[in-house]
């Protein structure tokens, strides 16, 4: 029976599945506020294989609303068969599936970073974990994107071998004593909707010009 | 309250019809439903299911004789059983499971109901 009717959303769940720090989540959240479980528990099998409908061990009567699934789902090639269920003690008050595709229905969340400014450039430090499975990586390219004065500008880093690891990119022929804010996102191929980090800004310092100017003064 | 109530068992003469309905309580989501069977001393039997799609299956003996059906807005499946014949008799249970159909279904389904008692006599 399929209960996707739009009008009926009591106890139904919204779920996400995000690379989050290149580790697959899956997050949660109940339409109906009303119903609050003490714990639930998550459990999924492959679309190939229906047979073994599988406990995901970190997610077994867990209080969270999310699960790291990122060393159960694997593939981007299987259609995995999700089920969420809520529980008030030993009562079942819920069960919420959804079917979920990794290449399809995962969002990619920026990657965290920092910024320092120099006179005429900025040096923008993506953090990678140090280690990353082949298979998270997804077809992504990592995007930084320079704002000034009303003017965008998208750098895209050719990033050797696998995203993983620390990465140093600069940001060259910049204007000295002039405000820059840089924002960081990973994009697929696949054209979704990119999620962009919040803008992270530097004055720059004056130049050596200006400098000797003002002691002059 | 995840819940599946099966009614509408009872007696009925060879030949007879009955038609048994299971209401689904606290399911969200896509799920495949089901009826099977079990007769004392023997072992569990599927009877027929139905994807979330509305695709059915029967068991080669209730073919042409069952139907399986549901209602989405109610959630309520139906199964209609025609033309019974005593070797009906079982307790009739209802089934869901996220999963859809596969060769061990009725046996591994998640979700089942407590069950409801059909006899056919001669």
């Known amino acids: 029976i399929s209960y996707d009717s739009p009008d009926y959303t009591d106890e139904s769940c919204t779920f996400k599945i995000s690379l989050r720090n290149f580790r697959s989540i899956l997050s949660w959240e109940l339409k109906n506020h009303s119903i609050v479980p003490t714990h639930y528990t998550l459990l999924y099998t492959i679309m190939s294989k229906p047979e073994d409908l599988k406990v995901v061990k970190n997610c077994a009567n867990t209080t969270r609303s999310f699960c790291d699934l990122t060393d159960e789902w694997r593939s981007t090639h299987e259609a995995y068969v999700t089920v969420l269920e809520g529980f008030s003690g030993n009562t079942t008050l819920f069960s919420c599936s959804h079917n979920f595709w990794l290449a399809i229905d995962m969002s990619f969340e920026p990657p965290e970073f920092e910024i320092v400014g120099f006179t005429n450039h900025i040096n923008v430090m993506v953090k990678f974990p140090s280690i990353v499975e082949e298979e998270l990586q997804f077809d992504l390219s990592l995007v930084i994107e320079e704002q000034s004065e009303g003017i965008v500008k998208k750098h895209k880093p050719e990033i050797k071998g696998n995203m993983s690891g620390n990465f140093t990119y600069i940001i060259d022929k910049l204007i000295p004593n002039t405000n820059y804010c840089v924002s960081v996102y990973l994009e697929h191929s696949d054209e979704q909707a990119v999620i962009k980090s919040p803008l992270k800004c530097t004055l720059l310092p004056p130049g050596q010009e200006s400098e000797s100017a003002e002691s002059a003064k | 309250q995840v819940q599946l109530q099966e009614s509408g068992g009872g007696s009925v003469q060879a030949g007879g019809s009955l038609r048994l309905s299971c209401a689904a309580s606290?399911?969200?989501?896509?799920?495949?439903m089901g009826w099977f069977r079990q007769a004392p001393g023997k072992e569990r039997e599927g009877v027929a299911h139905?994807?979330?799609?509305?695709?059915?299956r029967y068991a080669d003996s209730m073919k042409g004789r069952f139907t399986v059906s549901k209602d989405n807005a109610k959630k309520i499946l139906y199964l209609q059983m025609n033309s019974l014949k005593p070797e009906d008799t079982a307790v009739y249970y209802c089934?869901?499971?996220?999963?859809?159909?596969?060769?061990?279904?009725?046996?591994?389904?998640?979700?089942g109901g407590q069950g409801t008692q059909v006899t056919v006599s001669s």
């Open positions: 606290g399911f969200y989501g896509t799920y495949s």
């Open positions: 089934a869901a499971d996220p999963r859809p159909y596969f060769r061990t279904w009725y046996e591994r389904a998640r979700y």
């Open positions: 139905i994807e979330s799609d509305g695709s059915t």
